[in-house]
């Protein structure tokens, strides 16, 4: 719970708590902003981002944005508040523990975005939804 000696007035978003009243700690995300990428035509890719940051705000989640146009492919990794749109899109999957890419309509490019809320979850971006159940370890759990 919020320690009594920690100041909690001044403004509303000073201290974010969960439903149990525990202080919500921020998560860790890959945070390389926009980088060129070789990720193409794969079921999943690693971000190849070497920077892991503590998100600035406890409510922020991890986001990855994959874009392909005639010139290049880029991968963007950031922290972002799911209450706010990113690249004009709502982060619908912010509560997901995995970063499952979903295609968004953007003129002149192929645009995929995912968001997730577990530590460094935007390090592994997944383009195939079946990928989750084709994981042998997961199948082992399911059939045990």
């Amino acid at each position: 719970t919020i320690p009594p000696h920690v100041q909690k007035s001044v403004n509303n978003d000073m201290i974010v708590t969960d439903n149990n009243g525990a202080v919500k700690f921020p998560q860790l995300c890959k945070f390389c902003d926009v980088r060129f990428s070789t990720c193409d035509n794969q079921k999943s890719c690693m971000s190849n981002c070497s920077i892991t940051s503590i998100c600035e705000k406890p409510q922020e989640v991890c986001v990855a944005v994959w874009r392909k146009n005639d010139e290049n492919i880029t991968l963007e990794t950031v922290c972002h508040d799911p209450k706010l749109p990113y690249h004009d899109f709502i982060l619908e999957d912010a509560a997901s523990p995995k970063c499952i890419m979903k295609e968004k309509k953007k003129p002149g490019e192929t645009f995929f975005m995912c968001s997730c809320s577990s530590d460094e979850c935007n390090d592994n971006i997944i383009f195939s939804e079946e990928y989750n159940t084709s994981n042998p370890d997961l199948l082992l759990v399911i059939f045990q």
């Epitope: 149990n20 202080v23 700690f25």
Partner: nanobody
Framework: EVQLLESGGGLVQPGGSLRLSCAAS???????QMWWVRQAPGKGLEFIS?????????YYADSVKGRFTISRDNSKNTLYLQMNSLRAEDTAVYYC???????????????WGQGTLVTVSS
Amino acid sequence: EVQLLESGGGLVQPGGSLRLSCAASGFTFGTEQMWWVRQAPGKGLEFISRIDSPGGRTYYADSVKGRFTISRDNSKNTLYLQMNSLRAEDTAVYYCAKRRPTGVSGTFYDYWGQGTLVTVSS
């Protein structure tokens, strides 16, 4: 009973250094994820550094990266924060905190020390 006791704060000039300590008791320190969190006057909490266990991986907020170093001595049940190249904007009460999952998805218990005041001023 879980106790966290910070020390090492004080007045320091810009560009100076300080080392904060957090003495832990009442739990198995060596297995816990530990944090340093600060609160500047009239501001919200800023989570500046985390150290995991086992493995001791460390993480930092952008605001302190390259200047602050978190470490732990499990044999002494103590968490440290080495602060170099201090700036006026580092003035805050510094808390050590521990967090662990409750077993219920997405919820955590957290414990906090009383804090130690760091003032950076010439």
